[in-house]
C-alpha cells in the first residue's frame, strides 16, 4: 500500500538476497511502505550471526529502510552431537553439516547396539533428524549376556572363573561382602537383604566390577545414586521378595570384563525347568569356610519347587520358607552351592536361541550348612519381578 507523503523521500529499491525473494515488489517505496524477505527452503534469515523467523523493513521519513536486508544463509545443523559409546561418520562429505547433509551414527561394535539405522539428515528446521523424524540422538545400548564361559550341562566342582566368564558380576562391599549383577550400564540387580539399610547410608556401599580377585587393586569403581528395595520385602521376616536395584551415579563403560546380564525373555520359563542347569558365581565362603580370593563358579541344576519346600519344612531355616517367588538349585547329595558372601549374585542360564546368558535367580538364602545334603540354595525368582524392574528403571 502506498502512503504518499510529499515531504518524504522514497526509499531505495530493495534487492532480494541470494536464495531469497522480497514481497511485495513495487515500483517505488515511500514512507511507511514495507517489504518482507523470504528465504527458499533450506535457507534461513540471518541478521549478522543472529537468526530471524521473519523480516520486514519499513521505509522511513529520511528515505532509508529501518533495518538492513538480511542474508538468506543455508541452514547449518552444526557439528552433530557426540554419541556416547558410538561415533558419527559424515556421509555427504567431510564435516558437511548444511541442509540435506547426511550423517551416520554407529555404536562401538561388539559391546553396544543401536535399534535404529542411525542415519540422520540436516533438515530445513536446522536439526539433525532421523528417518523416523526423531531429533534426539540414537542410543547405544549395551549388549548383554555375552560370556566366554561355556556350560557343559554337567555338575563340576566350584572352580575359579576366567576373565570374561561373568562380566556382569559386581562386588558389593559394605559391612559385609555381597554381590550383584549388572543389568544395564547404570543399574545393578541384587538381593534386598544385601543392601538393606543402605537406602539412606548409600555412601557406605562400595561397588566394584571388572575383577576376578576380590582384593584386586585394579577395578572399575561405581557409587550408588539410589537404592530401591522391593516394597514387599520385610527384613528379618523371611526372604520373600528378596530383590533390590541399585542405580549407579555414572554409567560404566562396557567391555569384555564388564557387561550386563540379560533379563529373561517371556520364554525363559521353559529354560528354567527342573534339572536344567544354571551357573552361579561369587566370592562367598568356600568349603574351607573363608571368603574366596578368586571369583568362583559352580554349575547347578534347578530343583523341583515342591521338593525344595518340603526339604526346608523338614529342616527349617529360622523365619524363612520357600515361596512362589523363589526357585531352588543344588544337588540332593549336596556339595555344590552358593554361600554367605555370594548373596545378591546372579544365577544365570544360557538362552540357546539367542546364545545369550540371562539372570533367572538372585542368590538369596539357604541352609547355614552351605552345600548340605538336601539343603538347596534358594534364589529369588527373577521372572516374577520383570514388571517391577522395568517400572523402576523406566520411571527413574
Amino acid at each position: 500500500h502506498h502512503h504518499h507523503h510529499h515531504a518524504s523521500q522514497p526509499c531505495p529499491d530493495p534487492t532480494a538476497p541470494p536464495n531469497g525473494h522480497i514481497s511485495p515488489v513495487q515500483a517505488t517505496y515511500v514512507l511507511k511502505d514495507s517489504f518482507s524477505v523470504f528465504c527458499k527452503t533450506g535457507f534461513e534469515l540471518l541478521q549478522g550471526s543472529v537468526p530471524l523467523k521473519s523480516f520486514t523493513a519499513v521505509c522511513q521519513k529520511d528515505g532509508s529502510w529501518d533495518r538492513p536486508i538480511p542474508e538468506c544463509s543455508i541452514i547449518d545443523c552444526g557439528p552433530p552431537d557426540d554419541l556416547p559409546n558410538g561415533h558419527v561418520d559424515y556421509i555427504t562429505g567431510p564435516e558437511v553439516t548444511t541442509y540435506k547433509a547426511v550423517i551416520q551414527y554407529s555404536c562401538e561394535e561388539t559391546f553396544y547396539t543401536m535399534s535404529s539405522n542411525g542415519k540422520y539428515v540436516c533438515e530445513a528446521d536446522g536439526f539433525w533428524t532421523s528417518s523416523k523424524g526423531e531429533k534426539s540422538l540414537p542410543v547405544c545400548k549395551p549388549v548383554c549376556g555375552l560370556s566366554t564361559h561355556t556350560s557343559g550341562g554337567r555338575i563340576i566342582g566350584g572352580q575359579p572363573a576366567k576373565p570374561g566368564d561373568f562380566p556382569w558380576q559386581v562386588l558389593l562391599l559394605g559391612e559385609t561382602t555381597a554381590a550383584g549383577a549388572l543389568i544395564h550400564d547404570d543399574w545393578v540387580l541384587t538381593a534386598a537383604h544385601a543392601v538393606y539399610g543402605k537406602t539412606e547410608a548409600m555412601s557406605s556401599l562400595d561397588i566394584r566390577m571388572g575383577i576376578l580377585k576380590r582384593l584386586s587393586l585394579i577395578y572399575t569403581q561405581a557409587w550408588p545414586e539410589a537404592v530401591f528395595i522391593h516394597e514387599g520385602y520385610t527384613h528379618g521376616a523371611g526372604f520373600d521378595n528378596d530383590i533390590a536395584l541399585i542405580k549407579l551415579k555414572n554409567k560404566v563403560t562396557i567391555n569384555r570384563n564388564i557387561m550386563p546380564i540379560c533379563l529373561p525373555r517371556k520364554e525363559a520359563a521353559s529354560l528354567m525347568k527342573t534339572d536344567f542347569v544354571g551357573t552361579v558365581a561369587g566370592w562367598g565362603l568356600t568349603q574351607k569356610g573363608f571368603l574366596a580370593r578368586n571369583l568362583m563358579f559352580v554349575d547347578i541344576p534347578i530343583v523341583d519347587h515342591q521338593k525344595c519346600a518340603t526339604a526346608y519344612t523338614k529342616q527349617p531355616y529360622p523365619g524363612a520358607k520357600v515361596t512362589v517367588n523363589m526357585l531352588c538349585a543344588g544337588l540332593d547329595r549336596g556339595g555344590k552351592d552358593s554361600c554367605r558372601g555370594d548373596a545378591g549374585g546372579a544365577l544365570v542360564f544360557l538362552d540357546n536361541e539367542t546364545q545369550r546368558w540371562f539372570v533367572g535367580g538372585i542368590v538369596s538364602w539357604g541352609s547355614i550348612n552351605c552345600g548340605g545334603s538336601e539343603q538347596y540354595g534358594v534364589y529369588t525368582k527373577v521372572t516374577n519381578y520383570i514388571p517391577w524392574i522395568e517400572n523402576i528403571i523406566n520411571n527413574f
Epitope: Q47, G48, V50, K53, S54, R67, P68
Partner: antibody
Framework: DVQLQESGPGLVRPSQSLSLTCTVT?????????WNWIRQFPGNKLEWMGY???????SYNPSLKSRLSITRDTSKNQFFLQLNSVSSADTATYYC???????????WGQGTTLTVSS | QTVLTQSPAIMSASLGERVTMTCTAS???????LLWYQQKPGSSPKLWIY???KLASGVPVRFSGSGSGTSYSLTISSMEADDAATYYC?????????FGAGTKLELK
C-alpha cells in the same frame, strides 16, 4: 511490554553445576529472535555465553561450549542455562537478553548475581 | 573471534564538552551489526545506538555514532551530567558475539 527475569541460586560450590532460569513475559520465545545469556564479571567485562533461537536451535561461545547447555520450556515461556563444573572464575552477574537485530528491540533482565565458593 | 578494543578505558569530561570514544574491531564488521550500550552502576546495559548510527528510543540527539569496517565511534556533542556511565560496543556480525571492554565516562 516485554520483560525478562532471571532466577537462580546465588551461591554454587566449585565443581558443581549452575542452573539459571529466564522467564519471559509480553512476548513468546517461539515468535522470533534469539534468546541470549550474557554474564558480567566483577571487573565489569561482558561475555556473551550463547543463545537459543525461536526454533530451539542453540549457539554457544566456543570458550564455554564443553560446559554449557541452553534449553527452553515453551509452555512456560522460559529458557534455561546450565553451566557444568563451575569454578570461582564463573562468579559473575548473569543476564538473559534479546539483543537488538538492527531494530530498536532490545531487552535485558535485571541480572542475577552468582558466587562460586566453597 | 572478532575482538573489540575500546579506547580510552576511562575518560573524564566537563559539562558541555565534546566527547568521542572509539571501538576498533580485529576484523571487519558490517556497520549494520554494531551496537553501543550504556550501563550505569547497579543497572543492566541499555541499548543506546544500533546499526552503528541509529539512536535507540529515548536517547538524546546529542549522541551520535559512526564508522565502518574496523573502526567505530560514539560521540556526545555536549557532555551532560546524566551521560556519566560506561559505554560498551557489541558486534553480532559473526559468532561468537563479542563486547568491547568498555569506556568509563566520568564527569570532571
Amino acid at each position: 511490554d516485554v520483560q525478562l527475569q532471571e532466577s537462580g541460586p546465588g551461591l554454587v560450590r566449585p565443581s558443581q553445576s549452575l542452573s539459571l532460569t529466564c522467564t519471559v513475559t509480553g512476548y513468546s520465545i517461539t515468535s522470533d529472535y534469539a534468546w541470549n545469556w550474557i554474564r558480567q564479571f566483577p571487573g565489569n567485562k561482558l561475555e556473551w555465553m550463547g543463545y537459543i533461537s525461536y526454533s530451539g536451535r542453540t549457539s554457544y561461545n566456543p570458550s564455554l561450549k564443553s560446559r554449557l547447555s541452553i534449553t527452553r520450556d515453551t509452555s512456560k515461556n522460559q529458557f534455561f542455562l546450565q553451566l557444568n563444573s563451575v569454578s570461582s572464575a564463573d562468579t559473575a552477574t548473569y543476564y538473559c537478553a534479546i539483543i537488538s537485530t538492527a531494530v530498536d528491540f532490545d531487552y535485558w533482565g535485571q541480572g542475577t548475581t552468582l558466587t562460586v565458593s566453597s | 573471534q572478532t575482538v573489540l578494543t575500546q579506547s580510552p578505558a576511562i575518560m573524564s569530561a566537563s559539562l558541555g564538552e565534546r566527547v568521542t570514544m572509539t571501538c576498533t574491531a580485529s576484523s571487519s564488521v558490517s556497520s549494520s551489526y554494531l551496537l553501543w550500550y550504556q550501563q550505569k552502576p547497579g543497572s543492566s546495559p541499555k541499548l543506546w545506538i544500533y546499526s552503528t548510527s541509529k539512536l535507540a528510543s529515548g536517547v538524546p540527539v546529542r549522541f551520535s555514532g559512526s564508522g565502518s569496517g574496523t573502526s567505530y565511534s560514539l560521540t556526545i556533542s555536549s557532555m551532560e551530567a546524566d551521560d556519566a556511565a560506561t559505554y560498551y560496543c557489541l558486534q553480532y556480525n559473526r559468532s561468537p558475539l563479542t563486547f568491547g571492554a568498555g569506556t568509563k565516562l566520568e564527569l570532571k
